[in-house]
């Protein structure tokens, strides 16, 4: 396996609707046609896969139907969006990129994006 550099922002703040977006950029050493992107969450000293998608260069990322992730690709950048986040989902979200085809296989792991999620305050009841 050959190593590849993966860059991602250090910190992202989720929106009030629990949506966080960030770019995962990889330094592709060749012309990959098949790429796999995996997002893993690190919290409480444990890593767990959040979502994964394999895509052909030039095509859209396809996550599973029940995935909380969506994304688009542009060249060597993947724009990832994670939805349905709550305060308890705050953590380090790590981008792992694999160039699956053609050989040789390349793998890179980003340093992670710390996503902060703040649950919105409930609206006070209004008397009209």
């Amino acid at each position: 396996c050959k190593a590849m550099h993966v860059a991602q922002p250090a910190v992202v703040l989720a929106s009030s609707r629990g949506i966080a977006s960030f770019v995962c950029e990889y330094a592709s050493p060749g012309k990959a046609t098949e790429v796999r992107v995996t997002v893993l969450r690190q919290a409480d000293s444990q890593v767990t896969e959040v979502c994964a998608a394999t895509y052909m260069m030039g095509n859209e990322l396809t996550f599973l139907d029940d995935s909380i992730c969506t994304g688009t690709s542009s060249g060597n950048q993947v724009n990832l969006t994670i939805q349905g986040l709550r305060a308890m989902d705050t953590g380090l979200y790590i981008c792992k990129v694999e160039l699956m085809y053609p050989p040789p296989y390349y793998l890179g792991i980003g340093n992670g994006t710390q996503i902060y999620v703040i649950d919105p305050e409930p609206c006070p009841d209004s008397d009209f």
């Epitope: 396996c1 190593a3 550099h5 995996t38 444990q46 793998l107 792991i109 992670g112």
Partner: antibody
Framework: EVQLVESGGGLVQPGGSLRLSCAAS?????????WAWIRQAPGKGLEWVSS????????YYADSVKGRFTISRDNSKNTLYLQLNSLRAEDTAVYYC??????????WGQGTLVTVSS | DIQLTQSPSSLSASVGDRVTITCSAS?????VYWYQQKPGKAPKLLIY???SLESGVPSRFSGSGSGTDFTLTISSLQPEDFATYYC?????????FGQGTKVEIK
Amino acid sequence: EVQLVESGGGLVQPGGSLRLSCAASGYSITSGYYWAWIRQAPGKGLEWVSSISGSGSTTYYADSVKGRFTISRDNSKNTLYLQLNSLRAEDTAVYYCARDGFGYFDYWGQGTLVTVSS
Amino acid sequence: DIQLTQSPSSLSASVGDRVTITCSASSSVSYVYWYQQKPGKAPKLLIYDASSLESGVPSRFSGSGSGTDFTLTISSLQPEDFATYYCVQGLQTPWTFGQGTKVEIK
């Protein structure tokens, strides 16, 4: 070509400490991968022990060693360390360091034997 | 933690035999790797992503499976293939290994 060379193993009494080293060459330990320690007790299978991120900011441990072992690195020496404290007989094993792509361990050292015995 | 169970634990086979080793996960995993280990040596990566052959590994080795059930196949066993084989999952920490399958000479 990536090469990993472990050292620091030896005989230690229960409750004692050791520091294992893993010197990497052919690749910077700060680049694009995690780094792991994996052990193998005599005649037994493989057990993942700990991993550290390329940035050094993130560490993970197996429950069996959490609070007793500490993984670290020295970028200037391109070296990975595992500090073993409060050692028990069941920690007796060959300890390997490996380049870690989240379970994808593509380069391994030759291993260093740690024996915990009175 | 995700548990990996390999079967069989050991097997005896002859040169030229087709050998199949299975790895069953306690929950669905997307990343499975296969390693070969010879006595006194460090493990060697054979298969990544369940079915992709690591560079330099002979084509007689192949991997398949998804979800919870995975298989390593050696199509025609060679003398240098007598060793212990391990599967590993990379879905979540702790990264867990199967208990190993020892392939011995019949």
